[in-house]
């Protein structure tokens, strides 16, 4: 069964800067990745970035840089200033649309006890929705 993993990390150098990494563990080809915060995309969450493997990347503040890390994983750096900056308990969600599996989404947040610069290992997060 395909799985999605989500890893959230607070940068040691900028305490209000976050890096979100997400990956898809499946055999299908990824057609689209949507990263949101505040909950799943379409269920109260706000889209931060949409990544297409060939067409390009779209991102919105406070997202600073979204990029593909591999053919099945992405990373997103968030700016940490202003009213729309993330906080330690913010939930981030990644939705991978894949053919032929369908859509798979998982969410994660900063581990409660993590020190700046540390993060939980990128283990598969619970799958919230599979369309």
């Amino acid at each position: 069964t395909p799985e999605v993993w989500v890893q959230v990390r607070m940068e040691a150098t900028e305490l209000s800067s976050f890096t979100i990494r997400c990956g898809f563990l499946g055999s299908g080809s990824i057609s689209l990745v949507t990263v949101s915060w505040g909950g799943p995309n379409g269920a109260g969450g706000t889209t931060l970035a949409v990544l297409h493997p060939e067409r390009g990347i779209r991102q919105w503040a406070p997202a600073r840089q979204a990029r593909w890390e591999t053919q099945s994983s992405i990373s997103l750096i968030l700016e940490g200033s202003g009213a729309s900056s993330p906080c330690a308990n913010t939930t981030f969600c990644c939705k991978f649309a894949s053919f032929p599996e369908g859509s798979w989404e998982a969410c994660g947040s900063l581990p409660p006890s993590s020190d700046p610069g540390l993060s939980a290992p990128p283990t598969p997060a619970p799958i919230l929705r599979a369309d």
């Epitope: 379409g42 889209t47 067409r55 779209r58 919105w60 593909w68 591999t70």
Partner: antibody
Framework: QVQLQQSGAELVKPGASVKISCKAT????????IEWVKQRPGHGLAWIGE????????NYNEKFKGKATFTADTSSNTAYMQLSSLTSEDSAVYYC???????WGQGTLVTVSA | DIVMTQSPSSLSVSAGEKVTMSCKSS????????????LAWYQQKPGQPPKLLIY???TRESGVPDRFTGSGSGTDFTLTISSVQAEDLAVYYC????????TFAAGTKLELK
């Protein structure tokens, strides 16, 4: 199928403002950016910016900040671009587009003339 | 901003000819993570909006005839029309889809000889 239908041509006076609409059908309007592109004869294509209708998040080309303002109404699947303090340099065809420029509206001609 | 440059600015061709046009970017459009080039090609006919032909430097958009081929990587790209048809006469634009703001080249006008 996906369609983007733009409002009709506008003739406006210098210094005035104009609001162009772009109605989207055939896809989930809130999930993908509506991009706005300017085309003047001899000046090619220039990206003005984009709005993500679901959250009203925007990105503007620095060259058009203060000139263009984007809004979107998810209840009618319509995006809007307002152009302010118009001059002859703003006379152009303006296009809306979506899904990484795969789909385009037919264009709206804005003519600024006294 | 990434500057896109196309050459030649115009091409005069006969039906059935093979045509190539070049596009160069001031910065690499290659995403090292997934080895994809974020470059697109468009065709625009008079009085019409641009039409997406190629994305990802080499992937044809659905419905685009296979006589259109995109190639290249990094900063140098090419659009090839294997056998020009009358309906291909138009202006062709390449576009940086790698980073904000998306930028377009000035275009190559394909004319009939």
């Amino acid at each position: 199928q996906v369609q983007l239908q733009q409002s009709g041509a506008e003739l406006v006076k210098p210094g005035a403002s104009v609001k162009i609409s772009c109605k989207a059908t055939g896809y989930t309007f809130s999930s993908f950016s509506i991009e706005w592109v300017k085309q003047r004869p001899g000046h090619g294509l220039a990206w003005i910016g984009e709005i993500l209708p679901g959250s009203n998040s925007t990105n503007y080309n620095e060259k058009f900040k203060g000139k263009a303002t984007f809004t979107a109404d998810t209840s009618s699947n319509t995006a809007y671009m307002q152009l302010s303090s118009l001059t002859s340099e703003d006379s152009a065809v303006y296009y809306c587009s979506s899904y990484w420029f795969a789909y385009w509206g037919q264009g709206t001609l804005v003519t600024v003339s006294a | 901003d990434i500057v896109m440059t196309q050459s030649p600015s115009s091409l005069s061709v006969s039906a059935g000819e093979k045509v190539t046009m070049s596009c160069k970017s001031s910065q690499s459009l290659l995403n090292s993570g997934n080895q994809k080039n974020y470059l697109a090609w468009y065709q625009q006919k008079p009085g019409q909006p641009p039409k997406l032909l190629i994305y990802g430097a080499s992937t044809r958009e659905s419905g685009v005839p296979d006589r259109f081929t995109g190639s290249g990587s990094g900063t140098d790209f090419t659009l090839t029309i294997s056998s020009v048809q009358a309906e291909d006469l138009a202006v062709y634009y390449c576009q940086n889809a790698h980073s904000y703001p998306p930028t377009f080249a000035a275009g190559t006008k394909l004319e009939l000889k």
